[in-house]
Amino acid sequence: CRTSECCFQDPPYPDADSGSASGPRDLRCYRISSDRYECSWQYEGPTAGVSHFLRCCLSSGRCCYFAAGSATRLQFSDQAGVSVLYTVTLWVESWARNQTEKSPEVTLQLYNSVKYEPPLGDIKVSKLAGQLRMEWETPDNQVGAEVQFRHRTPSSPWKLGDCGPQDDDTESCLCPLEMNVAQEFQLRRRQLGSQGSSWSKWSSPVCVPPENPPQPQVRFSVEQLGQDGRRRLTLKEQPTQLELPEGCQGLAPGTEVTYRLQLHMLSCPCKAKATRTLHLGKMPYLSGAAYNVAVISSNQFGPGLNQTWHIPADTHTEPVALNISVGTNGTTMYWPARAQSMTYCIEWQPVGQDGGLATCSLTAPQDPDPAGMATYSWSRESGAMGQEKCYYITIFASAHPEKLTLWSTVLSTYHFGGNASAAGTPHHVSVKNHSLDSVSVDWAPSLLSTCPGVLKEYVVRCRDEDSKQVSEHPVQPTETQVTLSGLRAGVAYTVQVRADTAWLRGVWSQPQRFSIEVQVSD
């Protein structure tokens, strides 16, 4: 037999069916020009010493073979003895290691078998009623196709599916969408209506994420508040990476999960913008305010479940940074200014009450005064911090108040509202004899003592009603008792106590009269 012809003789090797899983597969045959034809196939397994034979049975029932040697592609003309206008059945037999391996056969009319391309270029993926829709441009001059897909997950083998007949300039396919695992898809096409035409090669992988992006499993930690009033939010644990099917590992566009960080600043609710969304890789600096932080995972199908954490406010207080002066017109606060043209947010809330009851006020951008201080004033009529109780005050600053991540904490402190000097007056002052020339004075703690850092000291005043001499005794804010010594028996005294803050002198308590009785010896 001539090599260019199909040989109508018994094949030149014995029959020894291997039954093995390896061997020739994916046989494709098609016309490549007006009078030439090509068949190509894949061979799976060791290729050393393998000889391939393209087998053909004509519609007449006669069978022949082409010897391809070690090649897996063979061309022949319409004069090779194979009828190209009638149906033929073709397959490959590979002879290796004394056994024969056979490919699946194809039955087709060669003249009408055109080499079809798989979907080329961009395959658009979208979600449609819980299914996956793929769409692509029909390859040039190839309108009219049957389309198949195959898909696999990281843990499952390929499964075959059918897209149905296509007859347009764009082709599409509805495929199953997995809820929680990524999938790899490949598509192939063949000529529509041409009995037994060969399938194209499989397309490049199309990598598809699960319908639900994986829930982010991350942990955060927050550093200490720095001198600049900001603290770094750091990621302790990266989100788990999505497991990908084999063909999607490495570069897998389409399966990407983006993690975004949504910050919600709970403090200072009167500012313009309370939330900001950032990329997870870019960890922000935060003020000492309270925040809710959500990590939102999303893929090309949209957002998934999010995970939320609460970052409590930094409650470290500055004992002396804030000056408050109370005048007839109202109250003014002074604190060290941060920089030029800063907007400040002053937030206050009664101590011991729910954070939701915080009130705040936003200043217009202001420059430092000549003493380098920033100020905020309010009138008595405004009612701000007007009740006689302890308030927790936090001042935040920003040069760009519209940018959530640029706020910093200036200070946090406590302030006693209303008429603090009167409200703080100690009550229940009592005097007890201590010795022949001394007494012990006790009083109930001032209301100011409920406000950390506000009560600077108590002052106990003792007045000799005879000589009108007055002595004053400072007492630590944590003490509510003092011993007065050097008193004379039989003399009338009055004692009063007041509670002072750093910027306000308190009001004396009601005078308490006492005297030490003269001891008469027997």
């Epitope: 094949p11 397959w91 056969e105 039955t107 037994g196």
Partner: nanobody, 124 residues
Amino acid sequence: QVQLVESGGGLVQAGGSLRLSCLASGRTSNYFMGWFRQAPGKEREFVAAISRSGGGTWYADSVKGRFAISRDNAKNTVNLQMNSLKREDTAVYYCAADRRTGTSVYTVDEYDYWGQGTQVTVEP
């Protein structure tokens, strides 16, 4: 070793139909399968053949358009649907398996395994 057992033969009126079935013990999905027949005093002749996947089918001119061969590899069966039967279709019908597929699908000598046959009789 493949064993083939035919069934479905019988007596039928001319113009009637019969469906012959061939059950193989062992995997025959790698073999071309064929049906042959032998009338009394005549040579065994080719009726129909089918390729391994069922994509390719071949028929003797005398049965073309009346007989249809099919296979189900999952069940290891090959069927021959015979319609518009004629008196000259009377014969013993044999199922055969061809592991090699040499130079033709219709040569008796090409086939390696044979069944015992089933009788088909067509009455006028």
